[in-house]
Interface confidence: low
């Protein structure tokens, strides 16, 4: 079942390669379990970035070794993606299911472009 | 690319045990609930059990109840069934599969394990 | 639970027809419905959730419709490749439940 995701059209990374965004899903009812999924677009393929799943009861939890991170509050998750690099600039979109209890949702964000740009290297001094 | 690998069928004499294994790669397994499908030779599919993201809920058929666990390792990316007390009628192919949701339509499935239980 | 009745069993066709199968569940589903291709030996392939939006990557050419009790896979111009089984299911509740299958063969 459609649902609406919003989340902003463009970022910029910070110069250590973080970048973080509000993604905020409509959402009739309070799911008791919400799944939120980071996918990046390159051309027609869509990779999977990081997800979680989590509950009313606990906190937003990204695996330990995720390149993401983030925080939940009502129907807003705070996203942050972390070790970017220049090569890594393109359109991340945010993708949220409403797990539980039923009916299942899901939506798509449109797509948030971050723009990531390698910071200079610092010149050698004497 | 995402992707289901399933291991541990076999030959089993009726009233033994056996563990099937199912390999996870390509998408975060610890997020998704997963299931096990079984398909009896020249049969159609039968669901078998499902279980939660984190483990805390789990379902099962009515004809698996009590003899099959399903568990699953998310350090692993790993599902397991556990099968005790098998019958000549568990003879089957044994799919895992993943759901978008917990009941589910299956997504993605693995090649299958067979499960042949005979004396 | 929640009986699904696919008909025909089988079905003979060629290629290019336009092919039907219908399934039949025992209490409203709403749209809660997924139809999988199957061929020997293989795993099943999902084609459609949610009564009628398409998998990632299905042709066009399958098509889904129905909502409550009576839904239809369609194949409107039938392939070479499209000769398998064809099973629904439903999980609009537990347990999740197929329905017998129908074979569609070559004439």
């Known amino acids: 079942k459609g649902m609406h995701v919003a989340q902003p059209a463009v970022v910029l990374a910070s110069s250590r390669g973080v970048a973080s965004f509000v993604c905020e899903y409509g959402s009739s009812g309070n799911a008791a379990e919400v799944r939120v999924t980071v996918l990046r677009q390159a051309g027609s393929q869509m990779t999977e970035v990081c997800a979680a799943t989590y509950t009313v009861e606990d906190e937003l939890a990204f695996l330990d070794d995720s390149t993401c991170t983030g925080t939940s509050s009502g129907n807003k998750v705070n996203l942050t993606i972390q070790g970017l690099r220049a090569m890594d600039t393109g359109l991340y979109i945010c993708k949220v299911e409403l797990m539980y209890p039923p009916p299942y949702y899901v939506g798509m964000g449109n797509g948030t472009q971050i723009y990531v740009i390698d910071p200079e290297p610092c010149p050698d001094s004497d | 690319q995402v992707q289901l690998v399933e291991s541990g069928g076999g030959v089993v004499q009726p009233g033994r045990s056996l563990r099937l294994s199912c390999a996870a790669s390509g998408f975060t397994f610890s997020s998704y609930g997963m299931h096990w499908v079984r398909q009896a030779p020249g049969k159609g599919l039968e669901w078998v059990a499902v279980?939660?993201?984190?483990?805390?809920?789990?379902y099962y058929a009515d004809s698996v109840k009590g003899r099959f666990t399903i568990s699953r390792d998310n350090s692993k990316n790993t599902l397991y069934l556990q099968m005790n007390s098998l019958r000549a009628e568990d003879t089957a192919v044994f799919y895992c599969a993943r759901a978008p949701n917990y009941i589910g339509a299956f997504d993605v499935w693995g090649q299958g394990t067979m499960v042949t239980v005979s004396s | 639970d929640i009986q699904m009745t696919q008909s025909p069993s089988s079905l003979s066709a060629s290629v290019g027809d336009r092919v039907t199968i219908t399934c039949r569940a025992s209490q409203g589903i709403s749209s809660w419905l997924a139809w999988y291709q199957q061929k020997p030996e293989k795993a099943p392939k999902s084609l459609i959730y949610?009564?009628?939006s398409l998998q990632s990557g299905v042709p066009s050419r399958f098509s889904g419709s129905g909502s409550g009790t009576d839904f239809t896979l369609t194949i409107s111009s039938l392939q070479p490749e499209d000769f398998a089984t064809y099973y629904c299911q439903q999980y609009n509740s537990y347990p999740p439940t197929f329905g017998q299958g129908t074979k569609v063969e070559i004439k």
């Open positions: 949610a009564a009628s």
């Open positions: 279980i939660w993201y984190d483990g805390s809920n789990k």
